[in-house]
Amino acid sequence: MAVTACQGLGFVVSLIGIAGIIAATCMDQWSTQDLYNNPVTAVFNYQGLWRSCVRESSGFTECRGYFTLLGLPAMLQAVRALMIVGIVLGAIGLLVSIFALKCIRIGSMEDSAKANMTLTSGIMFIVSGLCAIAGVSVFANMLVTNFWMSTANMYTGMGGMVQTVQTRYTFGAALFVGWVAGGLTLIGGVMMCIACRGLAPEETNYKAVSYHASGHSVAYKPGGFKASTGFGSNTKNKKIYDGGARTEDEVQSYPSKHDYV
């Protein structure tokens, strides 16, 4: 029950997180004009990953897409790539996790298969969340660097007497949405991985064998016994040792010379 709850909650948290990553990627307000020194302005500039916008005091807004690919900063391209990778991984993770949910029965899927799928989706969510956090953090770092560079440039002209009109940009709403969404996706992924441990069936280090009465004596072939872990060469349930013991998979039992004493 706790496993199902953990898995379900992990799925929901990841779903919200990925929706947030998509929203953040599409949002225009990744960087917004800093109004600290000039709170009353005729226009307000803000920029996203895909276009930049200008809003007038009337409320009228005009946005322009970045129609160039080669002319854009490498960092912006990197952020775009990270966010898209995050979305793609998250979407695949969601698809996998739907089939992995314990509360959903699909054919005769075993718990071990569901456990593997839960782990896979969990890892995908973790990587997706990390991609989003990394993308947003790279953009934020770029903003901070440019902010302080433009601040320094403001007071260098004419011995610090002339202040050039330069638009400085600060953190936009999309950054906070991205950070939170990335964190949620990451948490959801961790929860899925935790749920996977509860879903995985306990593995035994022996094969079940059935015994039948053989005779007065049982002849063992020397060196015939091999321990089976299920991972070695003995994966097809071959006879582990000769004599009276037979594996359950063997339908026919062949007579030995001791059976007719």
């Epitope: 005729a42 007038e56 009228f60």
Partner: nanobody, 118 residues
Framework: QVQLDESGGGSVQAGGSLRLSCAAS?????MGWFRQAPGKLRERVAN????????WLADSVKGRFTISRDNAKNAVYLQMTRLRPEDTAMYYC??????????????WGQGTQVTVSS
């Protein structure tokens, strides 16, 4: 250079209607209307992007004014209904070559007066 010819202004009673027209001598990226009342700053009323027909209306005129375009005539029309005394102003037609932002407006009309009496 683009010439803008405005028409349709006049005096009307409160609650009445007027239709302003503006024709450009050649095609532009965006066309719209601004107004300026005596002693006040110029304000944007409405605009339309000529290529895709996207429109914008100021909150103060939403539900009362509509803007439309005619690409064949390079013209825009501002249909004003339920006029109020505060709509009294000089209405200017504006056109932009590459942007609709006020700072980027390339061409301005001479203006047409609209007077709404109570």
């Amino acid at each position: 250079q683009v010439q803008l010819d405005e028409s349709g202004g006049g005096s009307v009673q409160a609650g009445g209607s007027l239709r302003l027209s503006c024709a450009a001598s050649r095609s532009t990226y965006c066309m719209g209307w601004f107004r300026q009342a005596p002693g006040k700053l110029r304000e944007r009323v409405a605009n339309v992007y000529m290529r895709n027909g996207d429109t914008w209306l100021a909150d103060s005129v939403k539900g009362r004014f509509t803007i439309s375009r005619d690409n064949a005539k390079n013209a825009v029309y501002l249909q004003m209904t339920r006029l109020r005394p505060e709509d009294t102003a000089m209405y200017y037609c504006a056109a932009g070559r590459s942007s609709c932002l006020e700072a980027s407006i390339s061409y301005w009309g001479q203006g047409t007066q609209v007077t709404v009496s109570s």
